[in-house]
């Protein structure tokens, strides 16, 4: 039966379907053709090495000619599967998860230093020291290799689920600019959530103009509260609050705002160095040093969920925290405010003062 729509046509994983006047077609990568990208132009059945000339095997797989269409067979590298080695292999049993190769890493876990040699999944991203204390950002992701692919700027469909942190939006960006146009960026930060709609800033990569263009759209809050500990004192952070919110909204591709307490005050609290239980007398006499801010944020997905590709919104605060932890772990968190840690917390009614 001839496929009449993209729903009926099975394109290989990672290959988009296009509706054309002559019916649906897979947008084949170079060197592949046919309705389902299974054949090679000009390759007769049983062709020799021509079928491998287009290097159809991905991720280090080796290609061998084959007598039947698509006239090649891929021998995939470890961790990859699929006709063209395009998909990460299913996660093996937990026992096969790579162990932490360095004995020294056990002692370095949680010491507030991101130790490069311990920054791997087997070592728990140095016990969270490299992942903003979220532990393993990919702990819910079943495809084993997704942490490797997170930073490769290519769409890896098996990693594009919420649990796998949307493959760092690689499948969603689709060639569009991934960051706010530098020409607009300063303007958008200065005019973020100022009550005026600036259409040039009303894009996900510029933070949706702080919802200035969405006053008619009802709020759609993600579950929970995103809690950030920022190593800037509250007065300094609040001085640049629009810039802070705009940049974070742009990173998470949704809208963020400070959670307000019962008095309408932004929930930004001084962060004092946490002290261990048994503290010497001299220590208790020290005035507590304010070394940062604890910031409580709400995630409003109203525009994220309205956008054409609305399958990339963070459903809860913890998944947004995991995404920030993942960016930190791969050293790609372009955010000019130094974060100590991030976490998602269940939503409770706002109180006048939140004990920390």
């Amino acid at each position: 039966r001839v496929a009449r729509s993209c729903r009926e046509l099975q394109c290989p994983v990672g290959v988009p379907c296009q509706q054309t006047p002559r019916g649906p077609r897979c947008a084949c990568p170079p060197g592949l053709s046919g309705p389902s990208c299974r054949s090679f132009p000009g390759s007769p059945p049983g062709a020799s090495n021509a079928s491998c000339a287009a290097a159809p095997c991905l991720h280090g797989g080796s290609c061998r000619p084959a007598p039947l269409a698509p006239f090649f067979r891929c021998a995939c590298a470890q961790g990859w599967t699929g006709p063209r080695c395009e998909a990460p292999a299913a996660a093996p049993e937990v026992s096969e998860e790579p162990r932490c190769p360095r004995a020294a890493c056990q002692a370095k876990r949680g010491d507030q230093r991101c130790d490069r040699e311990c920054n791997s999944p087997g070592c728990g991203w140095d016990g969270g020291d490299c992942s903003l204390s979220v532990g393993d950002p990919w702990r819910q992701c079943e495809a084993l290799q997704c942490w490797r692919l997170f930073n490769n700027s290519r769409c890896d469909p098996a990693c594009s689920s919420p649990a796998c942190l949307y493959d760092n939006f690689d499948c969603h960006a689709g060639g569009r600019e991934r960051t706010c146009n530098p020409v607009y960026e300063k303007y958008c930060a200065d005019h973020f959530a100022d009550g005026r709609c600036d259409q040039g800033c009303n894009t996900e990569e510029c933070g949706w103009d702080g919802l200035d263009c969405a006053s008619e759209v009802p709020a759609l809050l993600a579950r929970g509260v995103l809690v950030l500990t920022v190593l800037l004192p509250p007065e300094e952070l609040l001085r640049s609050s629009a810039d802070f919110l705009q940049r974070l909204s742009a990173i998470l591709r949704t809208s963020l705002r400070f959670r307000l307490d019962a008095h309408g005050q932004a929930m930004v609290f001084p962060y004092h160095r946490p002290s261990p239980g048994s503290e010497p007398r001299a220590r208790r006499e020290l005035a507590p040093e304010v070394i940062g801010s604890v910031v409580m944020l709400e995630i409003d997905n109203r525009l994220c969920l309205q956008s054409p590709e609305n399958d990339h919104c963070f459903p809860d605060a913890q998944s947004a925290a995991d995404y920030l932890g993942a960016l930190s772990a791969v050293e790609r968190l372009d955010f000019p405010y130094p974060l100590r840690d991030v976490r998602g917390e269940p939503l409770e009614p706002p109180e006048p003062s939140v004990p920390l």
Epitope: A107, Q112, R113, R116, L231, R283, I291, E331, R332, D334
Partner: antibody, heavy 119, light 107 residues
Framework: QVKLLQSGAALVKPGASVKMSCKAS????????VTWVKQSHGKSLEWIGE????????NFNEKFKGKATLTVDKSTSTAYMELSRLTSEDSAIYYC????????????WGQGTLVTVSS | DIQMTQSPSSLSASVGDRVTITCKAS??????IAWYQQKPGKAPKLLIY???NRYTGVPSRFSGSGYGTDFTLTISSLQPEDFATYYC?????????FGGGTKVEIK
Amino acid sequence: QVKLLQSGAALVKPGASVKMSCKASGYAFTDYWVTWVKQSHGKSLEWIGEISPNSGGTNFNEKFKGKATLTVDKSTSTAYMELSRLTSEDSAIYYCTRGEIRYNWFAYWGQGTLVTVSS
Amino acid sequence: DIQMTQSPSSLSASVGDRVTITCKASQNVGNNIAWYQQKPGKAPKLLIYYASNRYTGVPSRFSGSGYGTDFTLTISSLQPEDFATYYCQRLYNSPFTFGGGTKVEIK
């Protein structure tokens, strides 16, 4: 307020060792890493290594492994650095600093200890 | 290990001049850069941390920018007390390397 007070200048012979101290006050000593930095005359700053007073864990610049030994005495809030097998190359000012949480910028510095290696 | 290369190694400028010092990392370091000022016979002083945040008490004429591998310290209007040597430093991962320094002298 936060203070780091270092021991006085030392004149030592080649091949000998020297141990300098850095006494911290004005903050909870075990909460911050103590870092040591070398500055030879007219030269740039070199990161030697750091120690966590809480765990005793250390990180070193490869260049100073085997040269510098870092220790702490929590009871007196004092960090120590011992330099061994001294040569003229080790003549320098040595600073101790407080490494800030997670990122390790240095907002507080000791006044420095001048070590001169000469026969 | 990641190298931090500062340029120029020295420069001459007059009071009121705008001065720009650059620091290049041999690999991506994100925002993980600090800048220090050092005067002869004194310990260094922290000016900027995490690429662009001015430390408490540092005058607003000092600003930092950059991300990844290329960073800049700018003094918008040089004052007499700003003649000193400036260092960049890599943060977050050890080794916490310093740049070679830039000496700002009076023209």
